[in-house]
């Protein structure tokens, strides 16, 4: 995933004190034995900090070395810091692991901004607050990097949860989740509940706080309300989906739906913002500006450069529109919509200079690589990555931040014709995923 532009993301306190929890609704989905129910040991296993990533604790090697690892559904390598770096408190020391095996192969991963490079090997890996299993997985031991690790982020590596097609150096390097499923009885599915705080967190609050849950191998009922709605995974590389319609406060953007997916649309936990293709971004901003025109915001706000602030507790959420993305459904000519609030797309930012106010950054930005449904989207929902059935599920998150007037929503079905035409076919080249 594009690490320079797609800064890993933001988290918060589980249940977010400023966010009201919705009452449970009846789950109309049929039970799927072994894949649903309670996963108490995995709930609240993510932590993080605004704009810097949600991470899970993992252990690598024998004896186990504990590291915090960024959860990234937008890449496919398990890569960890393996040499001293000014931004790392700790790193993987291969020489201390009796189970480390060198693959005698290097890996180099450039991004639009920055890069990391390292040496490939395998070792025993487990997730303390995950399934009670240990797997031998491929590990890229990062020996050199530029603009990859983030000062103060508290994570030392990245867990790429996407498919082998985008693994580096090539698709023969089996991703961690594939290894996990092959070597254990863990079902081929994971789900993420990312909980935005609704307010900025300082370092000590972050270290003591909960940022959400990664449920490996199943779905936890307690983490969502209402029903799960599924959209097909269009192609198993990134978690690619198809957006068929976009509305701002119920007003259709009225664009050719191909534009929404140009050149792809992906679900990426490693990106902070909702990123939109240039034309779509411009149309969306124009519509959001019009809807919120009772206040005049600086141009720099829409660019993500300037913060906007209000006296503490007086943020006029009601002047900002809701944003709905309609996703292709599982049934022919059927779609469903996911709706986010300004509480998701206005990111709270702490600034000492304006500490008496509540300040926010606009967390929708322009993309040259398609739509990226990052934390801004995911923090509203419980997201199920059902790899076994090649689909992604969305339900309203039990921890999403909202107010007494509006909540995030997942609703359907809607009749939508010719949805297949909304997908963009990327011209295939050997380098098609390089520098994304």
């Amino acid at each position: 995933t594009q690490h320079g532009i797609r800064l890993p993301l933001r988290s918060g306190l589980g249940g977010a004190p400023l966010g009201l929890r919705l009452p449970r609704e009846t789950d109309e989905e049929p039970e799927e034995p072994g894949r649903r129910g309670s996963f108490v040991e995995m709930v609240d296993n993510l932590r993080g900090k605004s704009g810097q990533g949600y991470y899970v604790e993992m252990t690598v090697g024998s004896p186990p070395q504990t590291l915090n690892i960024l959860v990234d559904t937008g890449s496919s390598n398990f890569a960890v810091g393996a040499a001293p770096h000014p931004f790392l408190h700790r790193y993987y020391q291969r020489q201390l692991s009796s189970t480390y095996r060198d693959l005698r192969k290097g890996v180099y991963v450039p991004y639009t901004q920055g890069k990391w490079e390292g040496e490939l090997g395998t070792d025993l890996v487990s997730i303390p607050h995950g399934p009670n299993v240990t797997v031998r997985a491929n590990i890229a031991a990062i020996t050199e990097s530029d603009k990859f690790f983030i000062n103060g982020s508290n994570w030392e590596g990245i867990l790429g949860l996407a498919y082998a097609e985008i693994a580096r150096p090539d698709d023969s390097l089996e991703p961690f989740f594939d290894s996990l499923v092959k070597q254990t009885h863990v079902p081929n599915l994971f789900s993420l509940q990312l909980c935005g705080a609704g307010f900025p967190l300082n370092q000590s609050e972050v270290l003591a706080s909960v940022g959400g849950s990664m449920i490996i191998g199943g779905i936890d009922h307690s983490l969502y309300t209402g029903s799960l709605w599924y959209t097909p995974i269009r192609r198993e590389w990134y978690y690619e989906v198809i957006i068929v319609r976009v509305e701002i406060n119920g007003q259709d953007l009225k664009m050719d739906c191909k534009e929404y997916n140009y050149d792809k649309s992906i679900v990426d936990s490693g990106t902070t913002n909702l990123r939109l293709p240039k034309k779509v971004f411009e149309a969306a901003v124009k519509s959001i500006k019009a809807a919120s025109s009772t206040e005049k915001f600086p141009d720099g706000f829409w660019l993500g450069e300037q913060l906007v602030c209000w006296q503490a507790g007086t943020t006029p959420w009601n002047i900002f529109p809701v944003i709905s993305l309609y996703l292709m459904g599982e049934v022919t000519n059927q779609s469903f919509r996911i709706t986010i609030l300004p509480q998701q797309y206005l990111r709270p930012v702490e600034d000492v200079a304006t500490s008496q106010d509540d300040c926010y950054k606009f967390a929708i930005s322009q993309s040259s690589t398609g739509t990226v449904m990052g934390a801004v989207i995911m923090e509203g929902f419980y997201v199920v990555f059902d790899r076994a059935r090649k689909r992604i599920g969305f339900a309203v998150s039990a921890c999403h931040v909202h107010d007494e007037f509006r909540t995030a929503a997942v609703e359907g079905p809607f009749v939508t014709l010719d949805m297949e035409d909304c997908g963009y076919n990327i011209p295939q080249t050997d380098e098609s995923t390089l520098m994304t």
């Epitope: 800064l7 103060g152 005049k296 600086p298 300037q306 602030c309």
Partner: antibody
Framework: QVQLVQSGAEVKKPGASVKVSCKAS????????IHWVRQAPGQGLEWMGM????????KYNQKFKARATLTVDTSTSTVYMELSSLRSEDTAVYYC?????????WGQGTLVTVSS | DIQMTQSPSSLSASVGDRVTITCKAS??????VAWYQQKPGKSPKSLIY???HRYSGVPSRFSGSGSGTDFTLTISSLQPEDFATYFC?????????FGQGTKVEIK
């Protein structure tokens, strides 16, 4: 606390280039844009441009677009401003400033003197 | 570009005086105006943002008002450390522009 520390004074000949640095600390570097503003002796303030440290996206004042280049090194939390084809009227104090609402934080300034 | 015209360009006042500086934008900038104080040989210090909000740590004697095109900075009771040059800035649209400054001198 937030600090922006700039490099020292420079004396340059007309036609030369100068590169001024601004090292940031006390906040998450990639969360805020850095701006450059200059002030000629006894004059007002003039905005030159800005850079987003998270992705190196830049935006310039048209007046400086041809001669100014802003770059970033996130590994050292440092932003650079290079001004080329210097002329005597470029003699000024160059400030970096951090965004937020307007410019809450400023560097101490770097005096660039252009003289033959 | 948006022009920011400050007046007066200089003024003389005594400690304890109430001082008012105005700034006029050439077009509507909403409330996206900031004020800065600068002393000789020093960098600007942020005083006011969003036309009327004081930055943290700024004394309450400094206040700002206005919206649209007309803005005012008021120092309710001038203190010895307030003798300096004051600049307004619009950050509504690019390029960001500043007023030419108002020098507040001791009478």
């Amino acid at each position: 606390q937030v600090q922006l520390v700039q490099s020292g004074a420079e004396v340059k000949k007309p036609g030369a280039s100068v590169k001024v640095s601004c090292k940031a600390s006390g906040y998450t570097f990639t969360n805020y844009w850095i701006h450059w503003v200059r002030q000629a002796p006894g004059q007002g303030l003039e905005w030159m441009g800005m850079i987003d440290p998270s992705d190196s996206y830049t935006k310039y004042n048209q007046k400086f677009k041809a001669r100014a280049t802003l770059t970033v090194d996130t590994s050292t939390s440092t932003v650079y401003m290079e001004l080329s084809s210097l002329r005597s009227e470029d003699t000024a104090v160059y400030y970096c400033a951090r965004s937020g609402v307007a410019f809450p934080y400023w560097g101490q300034g770097t005096l660039v003197t252009v003289s033959s | 570009d948006i022009q920011m015209t400050q007046s007066p360009s200089s003024l003389s006042a005594s400690v304890g005086d109430r001082v008012t500086i105005t700034c006029k934008a050439s077009q509507d900038v909403g409330r996206n105006v900031a004020w800065y104080q600068q002393k000789p040989g020093k960098s600007p210090k942020s005083l006011i943002y969003s036309a009327s909000h004081r930055y943290s740590g700024v004394p309450s004697r400094f206040s700002g008002s206005g919206s649209g095109t007309d803005f005012t900075l008021t120092i309710s009771s001038l203190q010895p450390e307030d003798f300096a040059t004051y600049f307004c800035q619009q950050y509504n649209s690019y390029p960001y522009t500043f007023g030419q400054g108002t020098k507040v001198e001791i009478k």
